[in-house]
Amino acid sequence: MKVLQEPTCVSDYMSISTCEWKMNGPTNCSTELRLLYQLVFLLSEAHTCIPENNGGAGCVCHLLMDDVVSADNYTLDLWAGQQLLWKGSFKPSEHVKPRAPGNLTVHTNVSDTLLLTWSNPYPPDNYLYNHLTYAVNIWSENDPADFRIYNVTYLEPSLRIAASTLKSGISYRARVRAWAQCYNTTWSEWSPSTKWHNSYREPFEQ
C-alpha cells in the first residue's frame, strides 16, 4: 500500500482543516488508514482522524482544531496499521479556504432596488470576520448568457443593485462566496443559491 498523491490540506481558519490524498489503488480509507495530527506546541495532544473515501483510491479527512492562529503548525502522520506511509506538516494560516457565507436573502420591496444580504460565516472574535470580501454571482434561469459577477470589496455583507439592470419579468438566482486577501486565501465554496422573480415598473416614457 502506497500513497500516490500526498495529502494536501486546507483550513477554514476556525475549527476544521480538510486533507485529501490518493492511494495507489482502491482503498477502504476508514478501515485501513489513520491520519494522526498534533499541534507543534507545548502540552499539545495527538489526535486521530478517521478518513472517508473520496472516489476509489481517494481519501479525505476532516481534522478538528481549536483556537486556530497564524503561529500554528501541525505534524501529520499517515498510518496503515503499524506502517507509516507518509509524514508531513501543515500550517493552517498558509492554506486557508474560508467558510461559505450563509443566509443569502434578496429583498425586493425596496423601490426599484434589489438588496442582497448574507451572513458572515465567522464569529466576531475570529480574525477573518473583519477581513472577508465577497463575490456575488447573479444569473438568469432563462438565459445562460445573462450571467454577472459583482465584487463586494467593503466589509458589509450586502449588495444593492438597481432592479432595472436586470431584465424584468424573469427569474434570477444569486449566490455568494468569500475570500480574504490578508491570508491570500482561495475562494470559499459558493453559498446555496436563492431565487427571485425580477419585476419592476418601466419608467413611463413621454
Epitope: 502540552l43 495532544e45 481549536d66 483556537d67 503561529a71
Partner: antibody
Framework: QVQLVQSGAEVKKPGASVKVSCKAS????????MHWARQAPGQGLEWMGI????????SYAQKFQGRVTMTRDTSTSTVYMELSSLRSEDTAVYYC?????????WGKGTLVTVSS | QSVLTQPPSVSAAPGQKVTISCSGG????????VSWYQQLPGTAPKLLIY???KRPSGIPDRFSGSKSGTSATLAITGLQTGDEADYYC????????????FGTGTKLTVL
C-alpha cells in the same frame, strides 16, 4: 462574552500556601489554554505557567518549578493555581489569562499579600 | 530579569505619535510572534496587538505593531489622554523550555 472570574484577595503568612481560582465562561473551556501571570506592586508582568484544560497537562516557568501547581476542574470550567512556601516577595496580583501564544482575555486579578 | 527590554517611559502630547520598542533575541522575538498589552491604572492587562501586527476586534487602528529581526515596535498615533497606561510586549521563548516572557514595561504619559 468571555469572562474569567477570579477568587478574592488573600492574606497569608510566610511559609503558607495559597490557592487562587479562575472560573471561565462564554467559550469552550477545554479548547483554550490558560496562563497564569503575576505582578508585584509597582513592578512588571511575570509569567508563571500554562495549563491545557483539555488533558490537564501543565508547564511552569523555571523560577516557580516545585512551588507552583496548576489544576483544572472541567465540570465547573475552573482552573486553579496553588503557590506554596510563600515569602514576602510573592506579594502580588495574580492573573489568569486565556490564550495559546498570546493572552486574549485576562481575569481581573487576585491580590495575594504575604505578611507575618 | 526579563529577556525583553523596553524603554521605561515615553511621553508625547495629545494628537502626536509615539513608538515603544521591544528588544529580544533569536530564541524569542526572532523566532516567534509578538503581542502587546495595555494596562490602564488599577486594571488588568488587555490584548492590544497579536501576531506582530493584528488588532483584536474593538482595538482602534491608531494602534499598530511591527516586527523586524529580534525587535518589535508598537506605534500609537493620534494620542489621547485615555492612552496613558503601561504597555508590555510579550512573546514566547523556546531556547530551553517553553516560556512566555513579558517586556520590562513602558509607562506612556500623555502631556
Amino acid at each position: 462574552q468571555v469572562q474569567l472570574v477570579q477568587s478574592g484577595a488573600e492574606v497569608k503568612k510566610p511559609g503558607a500556601s495559597v490557592k487562587v481560582s479562575c472560573k471561565a465562561s462564554g467559550y469552550a473551556f477545554t479548547s483554550y489554554y490558560m496562563h497564569w501571570a503575576r505582578q508585584a506592586p509597582g513592578q512588571g508582568l511575570e509569567w508563571m505557567g500554562i495549563i491545557n484544560p483539555s488533558g490537564g497537562s501543565t508547564s511552569y516557568a523555571q523560577k516557580f518549578q516545585g512551588r507552583v501547581t496548576m489544576t483544572r476542574d472541567t465540570s465547573t470550567s475552573t482552573v486553579y493555581m496553588e503557590l506554596s512556601s510563600l515569602r514576602s516577595e510573592d506579594t502580588a496580583v495574580y492573573y489568569c489569562a486565556r490564550g495559546k501564544y498570546w493572552m486574549y482575555d485576562w481575569g481581573k486579578g487576585t491580590l495575594v499579600t504575604v505578611s507575618s | 530579569q526579563s529577556v525583553l527590554t523596553q524603554p521605561p517611559s515615553v511621553s508625547a502630547a495629545p494628537g502626536q505619535k509615539v513608538t515603544i520598542s521591544c528588544s529580544g533575541g533569536s530564541s524569542n522575538i526572532g523566532n516567534s510572534y509578538v503581542s502587546w498589552y495595555q494596562q490602564l491604572p488599577g486594571t488588568a492587562p488587555k490584548l492590544l496587538i497579536y501576531d506582530n501586527n493584528k488588532r483584536p476586534s474593538g482595538i482602534p487602528d491608531r494602534f499598530s505593531g511591527s516586527k523586524s529581526g529580534t525587535s518589535a515596535t508598537l506605534a500609537i498615533t493620534g494620542l489621547q489622554t485615555g492612552d496613558e497606561a503601561d504597555y508590555y510586549c510579550g512573546t514566547w521563548d523556546t531556547s530551553t523550555v517553553w516560556e512566555w516572557p513579558f517586556g520590562t514595561g513602558t509607562k506612556l504619559t500623555v502631556l
